[in-house]
Structure formats: C-alpha cells, structure tokens
Interface confidence: medium
C-alpha cells in the first residue's frame, strides 16, 4: 500500500461496492521467474584446467584407459515431498527427515540431452508436482527414496571434452496457471532441498564399464584415480527474492517474520495484526479530519500494532544478498500513531554481530513517513530486522510497507556457489582434493599419489627423479655457482637417497647470487584454495639468504612478489616442510629460487617434492578468500 | 586524492548562526554518508549527525536535535551544517568524516577541523 | 546510549616499546570497535575497524583485538610518528560513541 510513495496500482476495494480480494498475478513475469530459479553455472575455466590436467589428448591413450566423466543433479526428496503432502505409497512420512544420506536411495530421472544445451547454451531443468512423485515417490509398493536425481552424465561428460564455454544448469519450478503462491513455494521447497551439482572424473583402469546412471564409487578393479566434485549453494538459506530485492505492502502475504507472530483474528491484542485500510477508517485509527481520511488513507492493507507498556515487537526479512552500494531499507510508518514508540532497524549479518541501521525519516502525506536507512553491500548474507518499541502505558503503531530495494547492481548477485572437490581412495576414504598429489600419501595403497599425479603438466609435481621438471638457469659461465639436481650423498641423509634441486654456497670468494625458475603456471581459478608446498633444507653455515619469488606476467608486465625467505642460517640438516598459500594470484605465473651468499659461507640448499595443489585450478570456494579492505 | 576541506575558523557573536562547509574530492560523494562530529576538552568527540547526500535524508543525535541543520549540494559536492542560537558551549572544533554504508561502523577519513569560536 | 571507557588516559613510553590501550563498552558490541589516531595538530586518522583489521596505508605495527565488552589497541615497536591522542569508537548501536581518548607521548 502506498502512501504518497510511487509503489504502483495495487489491488484493494474501490471506493463502493463490495471489497475485492486481492489476487496474485497468475503467472510470474519473466524476471519474476527467474528469480524462482537455482542457476549452476560451472565457470569456463574450470572446463579448461579439468581438461588440461586429467583428460591427455584422445589420441594418447587407448579408449580403455581412458578418464571417463559423470554428472548428476541431486536433491533431498523430503522438503518436496512436505510440499506434496501425504502422498500414497510414501513409507516414511513427508514430516520426518529423509533417510541417511550414506545410505540413501535414489531415483534418477533423465537430464537433458547435449543437443538442446549445444542450441540454447543452458539446461533448463523444470520440477513440477509430477516429477517430484516420479522421482521420489515412484510406483505404488516401491520404497520411498531420499534422493531425486536428475542423470547429467552425457551432457557433462559431452562439456568437459569438447564444450566451450561455461556450463550453465538453471532448476526452476515448472510453470503452470494453477493456484496463487504455487511457483513460490515450489520455488522455496527445491532451495530447501538444497539442489546440488554432482561431477565425477575417474582414471580407468583394467576394464570399461558401462556408466551406470547413479554415481556411487567405481570399484577398484577399474578405476585409478576418482575425483568427485559438488557445486552447491553456500547459503541455501537465502530467498529467492534476493535476487532483485523485497517490497512488502501486506496487501498480500509476505516472505516477512514478525515476533510476536501474525494475528489475523480480531481478538488478539498486542501483537502484529494485517488490517484493511476500510477498518482502520471505521476504527478511527487514523487521525485528519474524516473526509480527508476516506480519500486519502492508503488503499489495501497495512500492519496494525496495538502494544501494551514497554514492549518490543519485531518485522524480520527473509536472508538476503546485496550487490550493490545503494541497498536500502525502506519502511512506512505512520508517525501520529506511536508518540510514545520508536522504530529501530537492525542488520543481522551472517555468522556477524547485529548492528543497528540509520533510519533517516521522511514526512511522508496524511501522518505517514518514510524511514529509510542505507545497508549497501555486506559481505555476507544478511536479515534486517525492524523492531518497534513502545515506551509508555499503551501505543499504536502502523506499517504500510517494508521493501528492501536497489540491492542488485548489474547482474544479479543470487547466491554464491562453492565448488568442492574430492578424491576418493581405493577403500572408499574421501580426501579433499589438495591432499592429492602432495608428496604425502593419505590413501592406505597411495593411489593418491600416483597416476594422475605422474600425469599433470610439466612442474605441477616435481620429485626430481627425471631431471629437473621445467626449472630452468639463465646461461651460465663454467665458473657461475648454479643450481643441480642430484642425491644428498652423506651417511646422514639415509632417509632421503632421491633426487633434489640442490646449490652448494661453498668457497667463493665474494658475494654471489643464483636463480633457478620454474616452468609457467596458469592464473587460478578466482577465490580458490590455492597452495604451494615444497620440502626444503639448508645444510652447515649460510652466510646469506634464500629467497621464493612469484612472478605474475600482468598485462605484459612482471610483477615479483616474495612468499618464503630464510636469511643466515645455521641449520639442522633436517628436511623442512611448507604450504604457502597463493593468495591473490590473478595471471598466470612461475616461481624463482633466488640465493645470494658471501663469504665464508658453507651450506648446501636444497628443494624437493614440489607441487601446486590441483585446487588451484579445481575448486572454487562459495566465498571469496581475500577480505576487501572496506571500512 | 582523496579529500574532505573543511572551511575555515570562524569567529560569531552569541545567539547567530553559522554554516560550516565541508567538501569532498577523489571519490562519488553520494556513495558515502556524511557525518559531524564535535570535539570539546570536557566531552572529547561526540557524534552530532549524518546526511546521505544521494536522498538528503538526515539522522541525528538527539543531543543536537535542533542544534545543527544538516544539508548536501550533490552538484558541488559539499556537505553543509548550520549551528544555530549559538552558545559559548558551541564553541570546539567540528569535523566532518565520511561513512561507508556497509564499513558502517566506522569513519574511514575525516575533514581537518573547522574551530569556531562564540564570542561576544 | 553507549559508554566507551578509555584507559590509561595518557601515557609515556620509549621509541621501541610495545604500547596497549584499552577500551570498555558498557554493553557487548560485537566487534564493532575502531580505532582512530589524532595528530597534535588537529589531524584524525582511522587506524583499525572492525576489532582487528587494519585500514589501508596503516603500518602492520598496529594491531587490534579484542571481543564483547573488552577491546585493545597495541602499537608493538613505538615510532616518533605515534605521538599522537588515540580515540575508540564502538559503532554497534546508534548513536556512535567514543572513548575519552589516551594521549601518548615519548618519555
């Protein structure tokens, strides 16, 4: 309902005749619509790396031994089932929570085919009421299952080896003309059974299998290395309409919570009642002169507050996202109303402390003003909770709307999707996926690091055993100190007989310095869990320091960061071990072993078992790790 | 760079208005809040208000409540506050600072001070 | 509204020293606590928002910690620079309040 705010025609009643009931518009507009919808977009990139790092060109290796690619769209049956009802032939109730996932049952129905995601560039996968007793339900005398699975294999399978492009996967609720707040709450049912992305890249081994259209873990006997990936929200939580913001004039059932609840019977005081603005009038609610209140008092609905002394009573938005600097709480309140109350705005970020919001008022017309507070762009997910506390014997409070508005900018925001990956061991142990090909073996039977390991581009997992992996020295004169790769030979380092990248600081006699460079690495994916890790050890007396440097080609330019440094060591001779974390890493970029050295100094560096985790380029976090420096 | 000028030292009689300036550069000056704060021996800084230059909503502290008129020129980008019936109490330095909406908690640059001085 | 209680109020300390100041609300505010350096002459500078995060161009000397009701400020290797009068202001609740301020000066 508006008051002197250009909200738009609502349905209310008209100035005679008998009062119409309000009606949702049957059918949602198209950006309505989409905001209904769960979109998965797996970014290009991704496809990439995935390719450049597991899939060799088909040509290298025989069709047996070839990856092989799954996918499949998952989600929990039991808030959809809530949403049919009791339906026949359920053998555990749509109330009770579904079975465990480890053991849960799925039926899987059939995703889309390669030829319509090649034509529209996206898969629209569309959940009616049909699809969900299908999936979930299944013929009459069959058990319930707790998974609804929608098979992705070919197209995913199809994306990965000759896609371009990011993959894009939108599940929305069917459209059909049926009753008001259908889609809605369709909408919210398939976000609460928290949709997720299933991908599955697995080395084959002895034999081919036909690719079952579940996805459990392939046996032994035919896989070598199985890599598991999730794509879901980070915050299922959030509603749908935080995609293009929330305008609330109680005219028709809102995605608000109030405290203490909502009362639509007349009889109960002290608590939030939704009344008509026609009521309102023969109550006398409202003050101005009574001709002027039937003409001017807002049409539709608004919220009536009658509180008893010293009380507080809360409006809780639903979770929201903000993209955009301009977010704003807008409420209408009536101001003649609650002499002795105030109105305190709160923002309730997630996993954050409440913090109160500056309402700046606006006199609206007729006794009505706008109170209006900037929220502009948290970093997280977020509810605005609006909270009215009375201060004397009694008061009235009125709200006309609550809209939360301009907090999309550009594109929508939505909600962030994380993508986890995982390895999966031969005995069935899932490790994150930086455990694989670390130089430490997580599996019982080491397989990860094995094969695939062996397999990564050249640098990507260095042991020096074949030489020296892309590192690479400037031309040097015979008499330059240079960098080797060898075996520690020396009764003490019995434990370590392999290869190393070693330099030998002995007998100069003035100041020298030595670099070694790797080979180029790829920009990471943005906002992924990217590290580095090397073993290194410096042996007797270093008069000097031992630098890592990452330089990122940016735009042509280089630009050299250090990440790691030890300076005049005394050392123990024990292999040390690291993980740096490569933060903010945006171009592609190699790494620079550079030690300088004076005289006297008598050490040997050395450097092993270096690798760069695989979630650099194969996962993606939901939010982003660098913190913006915002104050 | 990023700049608040603030106007210079003024010297009123008891009882007349004022209207400090404060202009800023080197950034969207409707994408910030704009607040006052006053700095006295006795009572250290207090916070008087904020204007939102992009709507022209204001808030106050209802210490000042009558006190200061806040006021924005989105065009010469410049944030004004008028203190009136002034008093010898009036009589500190005032600083504007800006407010990132969200980074709402704190003040991340501020004006140099404008001094004034109630004196008959 | 919220009282920030400020200790010491001034102090002395050597080039080099590490020096804490500290800062109660009168009510948990949840981290909302900022730190905020004032120059002789007149100049104020936000150093720490939000508890403990640094605001750009602000020397990794300052550090900022603390939850609830109890917060500090600590400058770990003193510089002639700091000579300055150092102010918290909890921006939890509204209106914004601040601490009474600790005026540091080099012995």
């Known amino acids: 309902v508006g008051s002197g705010m250009g909200t738009g025609q609502r349905a209310g009643s008209p100035a005679a005749g008998p009062p119409l009931q309000p009606r949702e518009p049957l059918s949602y507009s198209r950006l309505q619509r989409k905001s209904l919808a769960v979109d998965f977009v797996v970014p290009s990139l991704f496809r990439v790396y995935a390719r450049d790092l597991l899939l060799p060109p088909s040509s290298s290796e025989l069709k047996a031994g070839r990856p092989e690619a799954r996918g499949s769209l998952a989600l929990d049956c039991a808030p959809l089932l809530r949403l049919l009802g009791p339906a026949p032939g359920v053998s555990w109730t749509a109330g009770s929570p579904a079975p465990a996932e480890a053991r849960t049952l799925s039926r899987v129905l059939k995703g889309g085919s390669v030829r319509k995601l090649r034509r529209a560039k996206q898969l629209v996968l569309e959940l009616g009421e049909e699809a969900i007793l299908e999936g979930c339900v299944g013929p009459p005398g069959e058990a319930a299952v707790g998974l609804l699975q929608f098979n992705l294999s070919e197209l995913f399978s199809w994306w990965i080896r000759q896609g371009e492009g990011r993959l894009r996967i939108r599940l929305m609720p069917e459209k059909k003309a049926s009753e008001v707040g259908r889609e809605g709450r369709l909408s919210a049912a398939i976000r609460a059974s928290q949709p997720r992305l299933l991908f599955q890249i697995f080395g084959t081994g002895h034999s081919s299998l036909e690719s079952p259209t579940n996805m459990p873990s392939p046996s032994p006997d035919y896989f070598t290395w199985n890599l598991t990936w999730i794509m879901k929200d980070s915050f299922p939580f959030l509603s749908h309409r935080s995609r293009y913001g929330l305008e609330c004039s109680f005219d028709f059932p809102c995605e608000l919570e109030y405290s203490p609840p909502l009362h639509d019977l007349r009889n109960q005081s002290w608590s939030w009642r939704r009344i008509p603005s026609e009521e309102a009038s023969q109550m006398d609610l409202l003050d101005g002169p009574g001709a002027e209140r039937s003409k001017e008092m807002p049409r539709g609905s608004f919220l009536l507050l009658n509180t008893s002394a010293d009380s507080k009573h809360t409006i809780l938005s639903p979770w929201m996202r903000s993209s955009s600097e301009h977010c704003t709480l807008a409420v209408s309140v009536h101001r003649h109303l609650q002499p002795s109350g105030r109105y305190i705005a709160q923002l309730l970020p997630h996993n954050e402390a409440a913090r109160e919001i500056l309402l700046m008022p606006t006199p609206g017309k007729h006794g009505w003003t706008v109170l209006q507070g900037r929220i502009g762009r948290p970093d997280n997910p977020f509810r605005v909770a609006l909270e009215y506390i009375s201060s004397g014997n009694r008061s009235l409070s009125a709200v006309d709307f609550f809209a939360l508005k301009n907090c999309s900018e550009g594109t929508s925001p939505g909600s962030k999707m994380a993508l986890q990956s995982s390895f999966t061991c031969w005995n069935g142990t899932v490790l994150q996926l930086g455990q694989a090909c670390d130089f430490h073996q997580d599996c019982a039977q080491g397989e990860d690091e094995s094969q695939m390991c062996r397999k990564l581009p050249v640098g990507f997992y260095c042991n020096f055993e074949d030489g020296f992996c892309g590192w690479t020295q400037g031309t040097l004169s015979p008499h330059t100190p240079q960098w080797q790769v060898r075996t520690l030979k020396d009764a003490r380092f019995q434990d370590h007989q392999d290869h190393a990248l070693l330099l030998s600081t002995t007998d100069v006699p003035a100041s020298e310095s030595a670099t070694v460079t790797s080979a180029t690495f790829p920009a990471p994916i943005k906002s992924s869990p990217c590290e580095l890790r090397m073993s290194w050890l410096i042996r007797g007396v270093l008069r000097g320091n031992v630098s890592l440097v990452l330089v990122e080609n940016k735009t042509g330019k280089e630009q050299g960061r250090m990440v790691w440094h030890v300076a005049a060591y005394e050392g123990l001779s024990l292999w040390q071990w690291m993980v740096l974390p490569l933060l903010d890493v945006s171009d592609r970029f190699w790494l620079q072993m550079v030690a300088w050295w004076g005289q006297g100094s008598r050490a040997i560096v050395a450097f092993d078992n270096i690798s760069i985790s695989l979630d650099c380029y194969l996962t993606i976090s939901g939010e982003d790790k660098i913190l913006q420096n915002t104050a | 760079a990023l700049q608040l000028q603030q106007s210079g030292a003024e010297l009123v009689r008891p009882g007349a208005s004022v209207t400090l300036s404060c202009k800023a550069s080197g950034y969207t000056f409707t994408d910030y809040e704009m607040h006052w704060v006053k700095q006295t021996p006795v009572h250290g800084l207090e916070w008087i208000g904020a204007i939102d230059p992009e709507t022209g909503g204001t808030a106050y502290n209802q210490k000042f409540e009558g006190k200061a008129i806040l006021t924005a020129d989105k065009s010469s980008s410049t944030a004004y506050m008028e203190l009136r019936s002034l008093t010898s109490e009036d009589s500190p330095v005032y600083y504007c600072?800006?407010?990132?909406?969200?980074?709402?908690?704190?003040?991340?640059?501020w004006g140099q001070g404008t001094t004034l001085t109630v004196s008959s | 509204d919220v009282q920030m209680i400020q200790t010491p109020s001034s102090l002395s300390a050597s080039l080099g020293d590490r020096v804490t100041i500290s800062c109660r609300a009168s009510q948990d505010i949840g981290n909302y606590l900022n730190w905020y350096q004032q120059k002789p002459d007149g100049t104020v500078k936000l150093l720490i928002y939000?508890?403990?995060r640094l605001h750009s161009g602000v020397p990794s000397r300052f550090s900022g910690s603390g939850s609830g009701t109890e917060y500090s400020l600590t400058i770990s290797n003193l510089e002639q620079e700091d000579i300055a009068t150092y102010f918290c202001q909890q921006g939890s609740a509204l209106p914004p309040t601040f601490g009474g301020g600790t005026k540091l000066e080099i012995n």
């Open positions: 600072a800006r407010r990132r909406y969200y980074g709402s908690s704190s003040f991340d640059y």
């Open positions: 939000y508890t403990s």
